[in-house]
């Protein structure tokens, strides 16, 4: 903390301007009025204060606003935002998307910091749900944002917001997250025609159930292998060879290269070898001819 000393004669700041970069920390503390700083925060970002000098300016604002900064100040924090702790940010009430954008801009190009995560959390909680404009903004700055949320948090995403999601935003999502997002996407895109629908829903299919995959297989969608490999194993297993062939279209040949990997490996084990042979791909490991397959799960359900 900077020692309190009297401001030297003639150095009292009348406005926040470039001359202040020549002040030592103790001079900033002594010569810059906190209320002046608060009203001219929009100038701070344009002035190349060192990080040490920014510490002093933050200290002045902390003293002026012990209960947390008003949004008029927060919106213009600029580089000073990098000096805030999650504890500082928890005191804020950020309601404007413009404020959120301004602060995310400062952190642009860096990993999501604890400060940014706290800011987003405060903002989303204040709004009550992750609306489309917010999601648009967050995924523009952090493509992996959606996949950083828990399934519980994702449940507050309204289907209308799904339109803002790009395929790369889902790259790091796990099946539990896609299980939540897929029904929302299905609802959001329900009025689109076949091929357009498939283009939009494709990234979300890691959460699709068997019946939806069966339905897609009737629509000549030509799913690529990368998408197929991300499908839920339990959703793929009940598909017949004919259904998988229709689902993949010309991409069916790619199954050979993936025959040792899930879900292809597990699916092969469930198919009759005769049926697999009809694909002409040399897939091995199916149920030999003449064997009877008992589905014990069905038997248990009936008893």
């Amino acid at each position: 903390e900077v020692e309190k000393t009297a401001c030297p004669s003639g150095k009292k700041a009348r406005e926040i301007d470039e001359s202040l970069i020549f002040y030592k920390k103790w001079e900033l503390e002594a010569c810059v009025d906190a209320a002046l700083l608060a009203t001219q925060m929009d100038r701070v970002n344009a002035i190349p204060f060192t990080y040490e000098q920014l510490d002093v300016l933050k200290h002045k604002l902390d003293e002026l606003y012990p209960q947390g900064y008003p949004e008029s100040v927060i919106q213009h924090l600029g580089y000073l935002f990098l000096k805030m702790s999650p504890e500082d940010i928890r005191k804020w009430n950020v309601t404007s998307l413009e404020t959120l954008k301004a602060l995310l801009e400062v952190n642009k190009g860096h990993e999501m910091s604890p400060q940014v995560a706290t800011l987003i959390d405060r903002f989303v909680k204040g709004r009550g749900q992750l609306d489309k404009d917010t999601l648009d903004t967050l995924t523009a700055f952090y493509p992996g944002y959606l996949c950083s949320l828990s399934p519980e948090e994702l449940s507050s995403v309204p289907p209308s917001s799904i339109w803002a999601v790009r395929p790369q935003d889902l790259d790091t999502c796990d099946p539990r997250q896609l299980d939540v997002l897929y029904p929302k996407a299905r609802l959001a895109f329900q009025n689109m025609n076949g091929s357009e629908y498939f283009v939009k829903i494709q990234s979300f299919l890691g959460g699709a159930p068997t019946e939806d995959l069966k339905a897609l297989s009737q629509q000549n969608v030509s799913m690529d292998l990368a998408t197929f490999m991300k499908l839920r194993t339990d959703a793929v297993l009940p598909l017949t060879v004919a259904e998988v062939q229709k689902l993949l279209g010309p991409h069916v040949e790619g199954l050979k290269a993936e025959e040792r990997h899930r879900p292809v490996r597990d699916w092969i084990l469930r198919q009759r070898q005769d049926d697999l042979d009809t694909l002409g791909l040399g897939l091995q490991g199916g149920i030999p001819n003449g064997y009877l397959v008992l589905d014990l799960s069905m038997q248990e359900a009936l008893s």
Partner: nanobody, 115 residues
Framework: EVQLVESGGGSVQAGETLRLSCTAS????????MGWYRQAPGDECELVST???????NYADSVKGRFTISQDNAKNTVYLQMTSLKPEDTAIYSC?????????WGQGNLVTVSS
């Protein structure tokens, strides 16, 4: 990667002259505002002088009229000409891009002025 190589420090008598040089690489030099910072033993970091991309210069009150900052864009080099040196100018001098905001942190050049 931004690199700044400083030279020209040393020991002089009060009233003498010294010129510091700083050669930059890894960024667009002629678009950048540059500055010289200094830190005396046991004192705070202080900005001594700045030169903006358009060539305009500014100085701390303590060095006005004695120090001159200049740059040679062809050589990617910024200079600090220090005349009428005083013992209180003794410090480690560092050249920085103003956008880096790091002030005196890191390496620098020792200038010692004895009376």
């Amino acid at each position: 990667e931004v690199q700044l190589v400083e030279s020209g420090g040393g020991s002089v008598q009060a009233g003498e002259t010294l010129r510091l040089s700083c050669t930059a690489s890894g960024f667009t030099f002629d678009d950048s505002d540059m500055g010289w910072y200094r830190q005396a033993p046991g004192d705070e970091c202080e900005l001594v002088s700045t030169i903006s991309s358009d060539g305009s210069t500014n100085y701390a009150d303590s060095v006005k009229g004695r120090f001159t900052i200049s740059q040679d864009n062809a050589k990617n080099t910024v200079y600090l000409q220090m005349t009428s040196l005083k013992p209180e100018d003794t410090a480690i001098y560092s050249c920085r891009t103003m956008a880096s905001r790091i002030g005196c942190w890191g390496q620098g050049n020792l200038v010692t002025v004895s009376s």
